[in-house]
């Protein structure tokens, strides 16, 4: 396993509507054709997984139908926007690359984003 | 690079007010306020956007209140009815809008605003 640098933006402020979009770009030091990223989320120590995707270089990226996690990826850049977050979800999120193929594999982690969520004053009663 | 200036702080009794000032050496889609205590977390305390729309934590609300002067690339924090529990490090932040959301890529130096009771 061979380490690799992983930046990611210190700060973010989540959109009104709960939705957190960033940019997590990784030093490549290879020709990777097929890489892994996982957003984790550090809260009190623990470490939890959010959401993962692997995708084949200049494809989409693929998460799973429930997962509140989207991307794209361009180069060696991958846009992440991370949805439905609520005050509650405000934390230090973690972008973590592997590159799984071909051989050598390679593993970076950022210093993580903290995404502040704030949530919307709810909207007063209405008779229309 | 954006180089931001605060200034404006000191300490002050409770219930006074204190007014936060940061130069922004150009023009940024987000800016926002965090402030941080000692032995705290940072903490945001109010953004606003090109909309422009504004956001205050739960704790300032109604005795905070964040403005920007777009042709001086200058944003405000007008702070009244002070608290004790506002006492921290008041750090501008500043970075571009990307799909809705605000990345506070740069960051000033800070000021500190001390509340005595």
């Known amino acids: 396993c061979k380490a690799m640098h992983v930046a990611q933006p210190a700060v973010v402020l989540a959109s009104s509507r709960g939705i957190a979009s960033f940019v997590c770009e990784y030093a490549s030091p290879g020709k990777a054709t097929e890489v892994r990223v996982t957003v984790l989320r550090q809260a009190d120590s623990q470490v939890t997984e959010v959401c993962a995707a692997t995708y084949m270089m200049g494809n989409e990226l693929t998460f799973l139908d429930d997962s509140i996690c989207t991307g794209t990826s361009s180069g060696n850049q991958v846009n992440l926007t991370i949805q439905g977050l609520r005050a509650m979800d405000t934390g230090l999120y973690i972008c973590k690359v592997e590159l799984m193929y071909p051989p050598p594999y390679y593993l970076g982690i950022g210093n993580g984003t903290q995404i502040y969520v704030i949530d919307p004053e709810p909207c007063p009663d209405s008779d229309f | 690079q954006v180089q931001l200036q605060e200034s404006g702080g000191g300490s002050v009794q409770a219930g006074g007010s204190l007014r936060l000032s940061c130069a922004a050496s150009?023009?940024?889609?987000?800016m926002g306020w965090f402030r941080q205590a000692p032995g705290k977390e940072r903490e945001v305390v109010a953004h606003?956007?090109?909309?422009?729309?504004?956001l205050y934590a739960d704790s300032v609300k109604g005795r905070f209140t964040i403005s920007k002067d777009n042709a001086k690339n200058t944003l405000y924090l007008e702070m009244s009815t002070l608290k004790p529990d506002d006492t921290a490090m008041y750090y501008c932040?500043?970075?571009?809008?990307?799909?809705?959301?605000?990345?506070?890529?740069?960051w000033g130096q800070g000021t500190q605003v001390t509340v005595s009771s």
């Open positions: 606003i956007d090109s909309g422009p729309r504004t």
């Open positions: 150009k023009y940024t889609s987000c």
């Open positions: 932040a500043a970075g571009p809008m990307y799909s809705g959301s605000c990345n506070y890529n740069y």
